[in-house]
């Protein structure tokens, strides 16, 4: 909902959390043959003034962190997205019940930072 | 401060917002010739699901989302951030007082996505 | 023209909550955020927080955190400012005040006054 | 938190005379984003000043703010009736948005 992760307590600055995903709590149980499930982990934290080399900003997530400490009503922090995505390869059946083996592209956050 | 963007109603859905920056709000005045300032522009707005064709989500997003259907208090919406982004050329004094032309990547939003 | 309309005086016993609104006419409402800031007998404007009318997005003074909740109603161009757990001290006029990007307060309320007494 | 400091607490002059008064800020103010108010008695504060010199709207050009980093000042020439009042700096570049405790202008 739109009111998740409101909380007035200080987040950690931006990085990268593991997250395991099943495809059966996904509900992808019957057509994914393989994996069972992948480490897809998840970016999660603050962008804060001052954004540090840690943090992967870019010149424009810089920018808008002083932009945002000046005008917070108006400009949102930079937010931590993947940086680093990697592909998975899935086994699967097709709309026609064939076995089919792809890769999937930008599945496993590697890497997290300020955009 | 850490209770900013806590609004627990609806957000409009994650679209590039225009900003223009001046370099002299940022404070930048005395080191930058020129340009005066530029349209930075920013990146806002929900990534719910469903996430639609517009949003630019990668697999990843589009996984993310549905874990925190499932588990909203555990993994949050995958995050709208830029998804193209182009370069500005800066008249700048450098340390030693010397007129530099420099080219900053990253530095305009051209497009938001969901990641 | 471009204004904020704030509602009338209260008395309120300490420890209850008080709820004052500032109606905005003549701009488009959502284009701005509006903020909240008191006065006390002799003493300076303090700062309580703002809220986005685009969004609904709020931050609060360290001060008020937990005791002051702003929102708004886009249908009725308002905002409201709710201010709990009275105490003599929270006597005060308080107003609304608009901020544009990169600006300080343009346009006030006239002030709405507020009195905790036993 | 920036603090500011106003000086002085209060300023007795006669109409027509020159009004200045002074602003501290705690720790530089590179943007300059320092705004001058004037408040009357009963009323709700007005702007004056924004940028720590552009006037707002209506504001005559009598009235002038100047200053730089830490000391900043509002001038008012040639004092009219609607000037006596308090005046109040304001720091709005980063939150929380600090006042100054105020200089009051009075007749004489």
């Known amino acids: 909902s739109a009111s998740d992760y409101n909380s007035s307590e200080l987040k950690t600055a931006c990085r990268k959390h593991e997250l395991y995903v099943s495809f059966q709590d996904l509900g992808w149980q019957d057509w994914i043959i393989a994996p069972k499930g992948y480490a897809a982990n998840y970016c999660d934290g603050e962008c804060s003034f001052p954004l540090n080399a840690h943090m992967n900003a870019t010149n424009h997530a810089i920018v808008q962190t002083l932009v945002h400490l000046m005008n917070p009503e108006y400009v949102p922090k930079p937010c931590c997205a993947p940086t680093k995505l990697n592909a998975i390869s899935v086994l699967y059946f097709d709309d026609n019940s064939n076995v089919i083996l792809k890769k999937y592209r930008n599945m496993v956050v590697r890497a997290c930072g300020c955009h | 401060s850490a209770s900013d963007y806590n609004s627990s109603e609806l957000k409009t859905a994650c679209r590039k917002h225009e900003l223009y920056v001046s370099f002299q709000d940022l404070g930048w005045q005395d080191w930058i010739i020129a340009p005066k300032g530029y349209a930075a522009n920013y990146c806002d707005g929900e990534c719910s699901f469903p996430l639609n064709a517009h949003m630019n989500a990668t697999n990843h997003a589009i996984v993310q989302t549905l874990v925190h259907l499932m588990n909203p208090e555990y993994v949050p919406k995958p995050c709208c951030a830029p998804t193209k982004l182009n370069a500005i050329s800066v008249l700048y004094f450098d340390d030693n007082s010397n007129v530099i032309l420099k080219k900053y990547r990253n530095m305009v939003v051209r497009a938001c996505g969901c990641h | 023209q471009v204004q904020l309309v704030q509602s009338g005086a209260e008395v309120q016993k300490p420890g209850a909550s008080v709820k004052v609104s500032c109606k905005a006419s003549?701009?488009?409402?959502?284009?701005?955020?509006l903020h909240w800031v008191r006065q006390a007998p002799g003493q300076r404007l303090e700062w309580l927080g703002w809220?986005?009318?685009?969004?609904?997005?709020?931050d609060y003074s360290w001060k008020f955190q937990g005791r002051v909740t702003l929102t708004r109603d886009t249908s009725a161009n308002t905002v409201y400012m709710e201010l709990n757990s009275l105490t003599s001290e929270d006597s005060a006029v308080y107003y609304c005040?608009?901020?544009?990007?990169?600006?300080?307060?343009?346009?006030w309320g006239q002030g709405t006054l507020v009195t905790v007494s036993s | 938190e920036i603090v500011l400091t106003q000086s002085p607490g209060t300023l007795s002059l006669s109409p027509g005379e020159r009004a200045t008064l002074s602003c501290w800020a705690s720790q530089s103010l590179t943007n300059s984003f320092l705004a001058w108010y004037r408040q009357k008695p009963g009323q709700a504060p007005r702007l004056l000043i924004s940028g720590a010199f552009s006037r707002a709207t209506d504001i005559p050009d009598r009235i002038s703010g100047s200053g730089s980093g830490t000391d900043f000042t509002l001038t008012i020439n040639r004092l009219e009736p609607e000037d006596f009042a308090v005046y109040y700096c304001q720091y709005y570049g980063t939150s929380p948005w600090t006042f100054g405790q105020g200089t009051k202008v009075e007749i004489k």
């Open positions: 809220i986005s009318a685009a969004n609904g997005n709020t």
């Open positions: 005040a608009r901020r544009k990007l990169w600006s300080p307060f343009d346009i």
């Open positions: 003549g701009y488009t409402f959502t284009s701005y955020a």
